[in-house]
């Protein structure tokens, strides 16, 4: 018969023949003849392959390398790699999370709408009237002024986006 | 490279329903927050609406808040944009915006060609 | 919500000119800023974010400057290409705002 020019999923050409692939997590340590079927050996130790394929060699697990902020969210497999993420209070600088940065704190005046994820920074929003941050952080809210009526008080210094008001005892009526 | 390809524009009338679509391909759109912004004729800019990446959250600018229903189907690279009530006021280009996203969220990279809606009776 | 506030609205121009449009914010909004570039017809582009970060593919001669709530976008060398609307925005805060734009022609 003809040699084939091409081969099934999951084969490839090779002197004229068809050979299967290694399976994922697996690598190709010899092609397959006449005789023999395509040999193939798992990836070691920190090693992955995520693809049918007849490579060589097996890639490297990659390295969540904390002196960049980085942590493993997911342990890799011979089929699969490692997966990053940042540290708390930290979100990748990249798609591929290769470092991380801090997440952006909300300056005094502002308070914090979403906290930040992996993919996206915090949202801040301005303090509406009513309300106060004196501190950046990105994780506190907006909070609402004191209510001085409710401790039977009376508001001496008015609040700001900043400052929570300052309440003060009700001046007494003189006999 | 990254396309955006809004469509669903069109004329409609006054407390009518209308919904726009964006077609992104050339990133991955599902690690991305999305965004809608629009344009009124010969106006300035305003942003609409935020989606994020997996669409858990949404926000909307007051102007449409309880109107317009930002959302996204990660398996068709698809953002949507629900509007009822129309409202004269209404009347722009819609142009569908990604999110440059990581450590520049909230500056929009990239900008779809935009879909013209008229609102008018 | 935070206002911004360009200047001039518009800006007429010769080729080879230095121009520059400035962007106040009505709040600290720290480095949080973007400038667009919008030619007739055509969707914004972003030129710099992060006040003064060049975006990928935008030439040399567009420069940023500033923080706080005081912003500058530099054209150093005025091109013909360079003609359209400049819009400033912020990124600081919820909801995310532009400026009303400046125009810059060609003399």
């Known amino acids: 018969p003809e040699p084939p020019t091409a081969c099934r999923e999951k084969q490839y050409l090779i002197n004229s023949q068809c050979c299967s692939l290694c399976q994922p997590g697996q690598k190709l340590v010899s092609d397959c003849t006449e005789f023999t079927e395509t040999e193939c050996l798992p990836c070691g130790e920190s090693e992955f392959l995520d693809t049918w394929n007849r490579e060589t060699h097996c890639h490297q697990h990659k390295y969540c390398d904390p002196n960049l902020g980085l942590r493993v969210q997911q342990k890799g497999t011979s089929e699969t790699d490692t997966i990053c993420t940042c540290e708390e209070g930290w979100h990748c600088t990249s798609e591929a999370c290769e470092s991380c940065v801090l997440h952006r704190s909300c300056s005094p005046g502002f308070g914090v709408k979403q906290i930040a994820t992996g993919v996206s920074d915090t949202i801040c929003e301005p303090c509406p009237v009513g309300f106060f941050s004196n501190v950046s952080s990105a994780f506190e809210k907006c909070h609402p002024w004191t209510s001085c009526e409710t401790k039977d008080l009376v508001v001496q210094q008015a609040g700001t986006n900043k400052t929570d008001v300052v309440c003060g005892p009700q001046d007494r009526l003189r006999a | 490279q990254v396309q955006l390809v809004e469509s669903g524009g069109g004329v409609v009338q006054p407390g009518r329903s209308l919904r726009l679509s964006c077609a992104a391909s050339g990133f991955t759109f599902s690690n991305y927050a999305m965004h809608w912004v629009r344009q009124a004729p010969g106006k300035g800019l305003e942003w609409v609406a935020l989606?994020?990446?997996?669409?858990?959250?949404?926000y909307y600018a007051d102007s449409v808040k309880g109107r317009f229903t930002i959302s996204r189907d990660n398996s068709k690279n698809t953002l949507y944009l629900q509007m009822n009530s129309l409202r004269a006021e209404d009347t722009a280009v819609y142009y569908c915006v990604k999110d440059a996203g990581y450590s520049s969220s909230w500056f929009f990279d990239y900008w779809g060609q935009g879909t013209l809606v008229t609102v008018s009776s | 919500d935070i206002q911004m506030t360009q200047s001039p609205s518009s800006v007429s121009a010769s080729v080879g000119d230095r121009v520059t449009i400035t962007c106040r914010a009505s709040?600290?909004?720290?480095?949080?800023l973007a400038w667009y570039q919008q030619k007739p017809g055509k969707a914004p582009k972003l030129l710099i974010y992060a006040a003064s970060s060049l975006q990928s593919g935008v030439p040399s001669r567009f420069s940023g400057s500033g923080s706080g709530t005081d912003f500058t976008l530099t054209i150093s060398s005025l091109q013909p290409e360079d003609f359209g609307n400049y819009y400033c925005q912020q990124a600081n805060s919820f909801p995310w705002t532009f400026g009303q734009g400046t125009k810059v022609e060609i003399k």
């Open positions: 989606i994020s990446f997996d669409g858990s959250y949404k």
């Open positions: 709040q600290d909004i720290s480095s949080w």
